[in-house]
């Protein structure tokens, strides 16, 4: 048997082209120069290599760049990116947004893979913060991206980047994440007028404190029930019946359908029954008339 490690005569690759698809795996390894491959990476995607052949090409690049690929190669990886492990990607230094876009395009339509998550993490850490252009790009590819970040990671998002966020980008955020994002959104949108401000801030309100909800109730915003149901329970509880009525406007009638669910249920328990009755919705469970309400939390704060 011939030792299959040396390139057969006449098979040395002069360029990366279609003729290579009929090279055996060992021939690709022996006959394709890694440096040539690196300079012609952009051609690989146009050639219908098998899954196994792509592994051989990746192996050649790994041997050429044991410390991690340069960005000039990374930008042109194309479908070879799908072969990279998170460990491979941790060696990279990706600084160009164009490179990030090119690799995200390869994974488009699929859920965020561990490879993509690692790539994004490397990119954002390299930039130092999640700037507007990056956030624009990431949420365009992965609407749920923002909500995949920890509150600590979200703290590095500058208020200016909040303009890139769409309501659907926040669909899966939990209250802890909204607690971090809301103040940034408030700052970002502070110069807008009442109705425009509410449209922009609405999807962030799950992080709003009581005083901001009280302020909104004075602006005829007509908050819908879906938004109200996402508010922090502790922020809703101190609101009076009148404030909730103003906050919801014509949507106040929806409280009846939600009276068994938080935060409506907990809010009802804190209101006087006769105040609830003024709404004419038949809400039950408020504090009966004649009962004295002691706010123990206030008492503790004073002592």
């Amino acid at each position: 048997e011939v030792e299959k490690t040396a390139c057969p005569s006449g098979k040395k690759a002069r360029e990366i082209d279609e003729s290579l698809i009929f090279y055996k795996k060992w021939e690709l390894e022996a006959c394709v120069d890694a440096a040539l491959l690196a300079t012609q990476m952009d051609r690989v995607n146009a050639i219908p290599f098998t899954y196994e052949q792509l592994d051989v090409l990746k192996h050649k690049l790994d041997e050429l760049y044991p410390q991690g690929y340069p960005e000039s190669v990374i930008q042109h990886l194309g479908y070879l990116f799908l072969k990279m492990s998170p460990e491979d990607i941790r060696k990279w230094n990706v600084t160009s947004l164009e490179t990030l876009k090119a690799l995200l395009e390869v994974n488009k339509g699929h859920e965020m893979s561990p490879q993509v998550a690692t790539l994004i993490d490397r990119f954002v850490k390299g930039r130092g913060q999640l700037d507007k252009d990056t956030l624009d790009t990431l949420t365009a590819f992965y609407p749920g991206y923002l909500c995949s970040l920890s509150p600590e990671e979200l703290s590095s998002v500058p208020p200016s980047s909040i303009w890139a966020v769409r309501p659907q980008d926040l669909d899966t955020c939990d209250p802890r994440q909204l607690d971090v994002l809301y103040p940034k959104a408030r700052l970002a949108f502070q110069n807008m007028n009442g109705s425009e401000y509410f449209v922009k801030i609405q999807s962030f309100l799950g992080g709003a404190p009581t005083e901001d909800l009280k302020a909104l109730s004075q602006q005829n915003v007509s908050m819908d029930l879906a938004t109200f149901m996402k508010l922090r329970t502790d922020a809703v509880l101190p609101l009076t019946v009148a404030e909730v009525q103003k906050l919801l406007g014509p949507h106040v009638e929806g409280l009846k359908a939600e009276e068994r669910h938080r935060p409506v249920r907990d809010w009802i328990l804190r209101q006087r029954q006769d105040d609830l009755d003024t709404l004419g919705l038949g809400l039950q469970g408020g504090i009966p008339n004649g009962y004295l309400v002691l706010d123990l939390s206030m008492q503790e704060a004073l002592s």
């Epitope: 048997e1 055996k24 795996k25 060992w26 021939e27 390894e29 022996a30 098998t50 899954y51 592994d55």
Partner: antibody
Framework: QSQLVESGGGLVQPGGSLRLSCAVS????????MGWVRQAPGKGLEYIGY???????YYASWAKGRFTISKDNSKNTVYLQMNSLRAEDTAVYFC????????????????WGQGTLVTVSS | ALQMTQSPSSLSASVGDRVTITCQAS??????LAWYQQKPGKPPKFLIY???DLASGVSSRFSGSGSGTDFTLTISSLQPEDFATYYC????????????FGTGTKVTVL
């Protein structure tokens, strides 16, 4: 003289797991691809998958997720981990070496082990 | 997905006969094809690689031909020890395929 010896077969209940081993001698796993093929009683050869010299693995579409091939070069052993076994997985399991010293499955399998019988039954 | 179809599934022949078995790939595999012989209770024996190259120690009465999608294994003069089942195998793409082997051809005594 290259030799391959499979072990680890036997009776296993449906839903159970089994790990087959293939001990090799006469060559290095760092230079050759190694594959697993099975044959149900009275049926043809059925490819399971292979592991290349560099450790990349490839599987038949039906085997992906349930079967895992691995190797330990220092122990000269290749493994086939089989999970969620079903009655239809009953077969003789062969371990085979890639015939080419290029380290990938380029030419075929040669040599082969004698096989180990796996019976999946309650 | 790449599939291999072998025919006939069985054939009967006499010693001295010329026997031909065909294998068809569902897409072009160049010459990336191997042939095996298997006898009952034994592992397969490697006969031919690269569609036409004889493996070490295999008798010259066996020959292979073909390229692209159509391949043939020929036994020029059938001998008693050749009664067995023959399988083709594509080695072009071994990832995520249903099976790399053909369905087999059983050669029995007429």
């Amino acid at each position: 003289q290259s030799q391959l010896v499979e072990s680890g077969g036997g009776l296993v209940q449906p839903g159970g797991s089994l790990r087959l081993s293939c001990a090799v001698s006469g060559f290095s796993l760092s230079s050759y691809a190694m594959g697993w093929v099975r044959q149900a009683p009275g049926k043809g050869l059925e490819y399971i998958g292979y592991i290349s010299k560099i450790g990349t693995t490839y599987y038949a579409s039906w085997a992906k997720g349930r079967f895992t091939i691995s190797k330990d070069n220092s122990k000269n052993t290749v493994y086939l981990q089989m999970n969620s076994l079903r009655a239809e997985d009953t077969a003789v399991y062969f371990c085979a070496r890639g015939s080419s010293s290029g380290g990938y499955l380029d030419d075929g399998f040669d040599p082969w082990g004698q096989g180990t019988l796996v019976t999946v039954s309650s | 997905a790449l599939q291999m179809t072998q025919s006939p599934s069985s054939l009967s022949a006499s010693v001295g006969d010329r026997v031909t078995i065909t294998c068809q790939a569902s897409q072009s595999i160049s010459n990336y094809l191997a042939w095996y012989q298997q006898k009952p209770g034994k592992p397969p024996k490697f006969l031919i690689y690269d569609a036409s190259d004889l493996a070490s120690g295999v008798s010259s009465r066996f020959s292979g031909s073909g390229s692209g999608t159509d391949f043939t294994l020929t036994i020029s003069s059938l001998q008693p020890e050749d009664f067995a089942t023959y399988y083709c195998q594509q080695v072009y793409d071994s990832n995520n395929v249903e099976n790399v082997f053909g369905t087999g051809t059983k050669v029995t005594v007429l």
